[in-house]
Interface confidence: medium
Amino acid sequence: MVKQIESKTAFQEALDAAGDKLVVVDFSATWCGPCKMIKPFFHSLSEKYSNVIFLEVDVDDCQDVASECEVKCMPTFQFFKKGQKVGEFSGANKEKLEATINELV
């Protein structure tokens, strides 16, 4: 399951609640074509990797989160453990997304 993040507080709470689990954040926008393309795959990964927390941030709805996380283009995937960013890449690349999850989980 992918949790939609709607505020900076909700984002911080989700990172805190994750504990030792890997958190994968998809920064996207409704107008972004590549974001739409990879969205179903991102959701399928949330089913495949039940021990990983998947979050979705709409950069227009949560500009403060996107700004704090220094997101410059979409989609951007960021990876967190214990509240710390441990990885990041931009682009709708399915293989790299799953490979990075496997490396960090």
């Epitope: 495949k48 890449f89 682009g91 690349n93 293989e95 790299k96 490979a99 496997n102 960090l104 989980v105």
Partner: antibody
Amino acid sequence: EVQLQQSGAELVKPGASVKLSCTASGFNIKDTFMHWVKQRPEQGLEWIGRIDPANGNTKYDPKFQGKATITADTSSNTAYLQLSSLTSEDTAVYYCALLQYSAMDYWGQGTSVTVSS
Amino acid sequence: QIVLTQSPAIMSASPGEKVTMTCSASSRISYMYWYQQKPGTSPKRWIYDTSKLASGVPARFSGSGSGTSYSLTISTMEAEDAATYYCHQRSSYPTFGAGTKLELK
């Protein structure tokens, strides 16, 4: 069509170094991780390590740390494996590979390295 | 690092016979991958995500398992199936099993 073209066979002396290349076509190496795998004669497959060519970030099996160095040149779409202080134990076929999670993944044809005086 | 133990190391089967080989992981893994290799050629992806057949793999092949125990089965052996099969896991540090060499009896 995705292809990985590896450099030719090498005959090298003990103690020397060798640098193998793997040139990709049909995709941009910046979009994925490039892996290297070792196979000694009549033996199994051993993962050496991988590189994320987009940022040069590498990861190695601890067994190959210090022995292998993986680099990439995105302008030529090529990944490299350098092996140092060669011994007879390094005599093997070395494969570059695009190890994917989907149905397809891709391997180079392999480069044979023979260490002999 | 996760160690994969394959058994048997070598086996032989007659055409039409059912073949099963196993791969045991030293720790729990989510998914197993299998490769087929014939002498003088590069390994070929054979099974991915534990049970999905790679493109062009005959339907007589199947994969199963979970946790630490996985297997590859050929329902009816054919001459072209003679090869070495390697199991492979894609955790933080990928590893391969030592292989099962399948010979034609």
